[in-house]
């Protein structure tokens, strides 16, 4: 029950996180005009990954897309790439995790297969979350650098009476959405990996047991413990010989131990 809850919660948290990553990627407010020096500007500038916008005090908003690819800063391209990779991985992870959910029965899918799918989706969510956090952090770093550079250069364009003051940009709402969403996706991924531990049966490492038959004694030793990757064929732990004696390992029907997590 706890495993199902952990898996379900991990899925929901990741779903919210990925929705947030998509929202952040599409949002225009990655950077917003810093109003510290002029809180009553008649035009308010803000920029996203795909377009820059200006909102006039009348409420009229106008956006222009970045129609160039080569002319854009490499850092912006990198952030775009990280966010897209995060979305793609997250989307695939969601698709995989839907089939991995313990509460959903698909044909005769075994728990070990679900465990592997859960782990796969969990790893995908973790990488997706890290991509989003990295992308947002790179953009934030770029903003901080540009902010202090523009502050240093703020009045260097003064020639006589004429001031050409640079527009400074600060953190936009999309950055915070991205950080939170990336964090949620990461947490969801970790939860999926934890859920995976308790999902599937593991291959039992049978202890050597002595069977005292009449006349002579035979010791049966199954092959050494095989490190399970979850993709092995002997998932049922079939016993080759049952002489009536049981080891303590055999008492549990589904021991919960996964060495690959």
């Amino acid at each position: 029950m706890a495993v199902t809850a952990c898996q379900g919660l991990g899925f929901v948290v990741s779903l919210i996180g990925i929705a947030g990553i998509i929202a952040a990627t599409c949002m225009d407010q990655w950077s917003t005009q810093d109003l510290y020096n002029n809180p009553v500007t008649a035009v308010f500038n803000y920029q996203g990954l795909w377009r820059s916008c200006v909102r006039e005090s009348s409420g009229f908003t106008e956006c222009r897309g970045y129609f160039t690819l080569l002319g854009l800063p490499a850092m912006l391209q990198a952030v775009r790439a990280l966010m897209i990779v995060g979305i793609v991985l997250g989307a695939i992870g969601l698709l995989v995790s839907i089939f991995a959910l313990k509460c959903i029965r698909i044909g005769s899918m075994e728990d070990s297969a679900k465990a592997n799918m859960t782990l796969t989706s969990g790893i995908m969510f973790i990488v997706s979350g890290l991509c989003a956090i990295a992308g947002v952090s790179v953009f934030a770093n770029m903003l901080v650098t540009n902010f202090w550079m523009s502050t240093a250069n703020m009045y260097t364009g003064m020639g006589g009476m004429v001031q050409t003051v640079q527009t400074r940009y600060t953190f936009g709402a999309a950055l915070f959405v991205g950080w939170v969403a990336g964090g949620l996706t990461l947490i969801g991924g970790v939860m999926m990996c934890i859920a995976c531990r308790g999902l599937a049966p593991e291959e039992t490492n049978y202890k050597a047991v002595s069977y005292h038959a009449s006349g002579h004694s035979v010791a049966y030793k199954p092959g050494g413990f095989k490190a399970s990757t979850g993709f092995g064929s002997n998932t049922k732990n079939k016993k080759i010989y049952d002489g009536g004696a049981r080891t303590e390992d055999e008492v549990q029907s589904y021991p919960s131990k996964h060495d690959y997590v």
């Epitope: 008649a42 035009v43 500038n45 820059s52 006039e56 005090s57 009348s58 222009r64 004429v162 050409t164």
Partner: antibody, heavy 119, light 112 residues
């Protein structure tokens, strides 16, 4: 057609308050902002205040303490109140329309109301 | 506040000829989105002002195509290609990048 009409007193005593009403027709105040601009006799234009379609207000900081602006969307009226009038507040006061959905600014002006501050 | 300067108080012109009216601002009106928040108004004698050009070069509805605007971030020009009698009046430039919006002192266009 679009019209803006200012109404109010022609003469105000110094230190008194001025209240002017701008009544609009041909458009709705829910889609347009309204500015107040004044022009002293023989001089240039001075911007006073604007009230936007959503009720937001921007004041000229030099006059903010003396100005207040309100509106009644249903009556299509905008009200300007100016306190502590002095002789140099003598001017023609215009109300001006500003679209909320386009790049135009101050696209239609009222005929103006001439206000004299004198004892 | 941004100061708008119109150096020529008046310009005499012969009907049919072209004329340029200049205006400059104490700060660049060119925004990072590429728009220049400079507006031109004409106030005919005894009338209210009316909008001629918005965002430096865009003609307002009803404005004759004789009027055109150009400029950099701080230097602006209103050009009237063939002056007519109805063009007489005071021309004001206005910035609307920052509050308060500020107007130039005006340039009076007179017929010779």
């Amino acid at each position: 057609q679009v019209q803006l009409k200012e109404s109010g007193p022609d003469l105000v005593a110094p230190s008194q308050s001025l209240s002017i009403t701008c009544t609009v027709s041909g458009f709705s105040l829910t889609n347009y902002g309204v500015h107040w601009v004044r022009q002293p006799p023989g001089k240039g234009l001075e911007w006073l205040v604007v009230i936007w379609s959503d009720g937001r207000i921007n004041y000229n900081s030099a006059l903010k303490s003396r100005l207040s602006i309100t509106k009644d969307n249903s009556k299509r009226q905008v009200f300007l109140k100016m306190n502590s009038l002095q002789i140099d507040d003598t001017a023609i006061y215009y109300c001006v329309r500003h679209p909320a959905f386009g790049p135009h600014a101050m696209d239609y002006w009222g005929q103006g109301i001439s206000v004299t501050v004198s004892s | 506040d941004i100061v708008m300067t119109q150096d020529a108080p008046s310009i005499p012109v012969t009907p049919g000829e072209s004329v340029s009216i200049s205006c400059r601002s104490s700060k660049s009106l060119l925004n990072s989105n590429g728009n220049t928040y400079l507006y031109w108004f004409l106030q005919r004698p005894g009338q209210s002002p009316h909008l001629l050009l918005y965002r430096m070069s865009n003609p307002a509805s009803g404005a004759p195509d004789r009027f055109s605007g150009s400029g950099s971030g701080t230097e602006f020009t209103l050009r009237i290609s063939r002056v007519e009698a109805e063009d007489v009046g005071v021309y004001y430039c206005m910035q609307y990048l920052e509050y308060p919006p500020t107007f130039g002192a005006g340039t009076r266009l007179e017929l010779k």
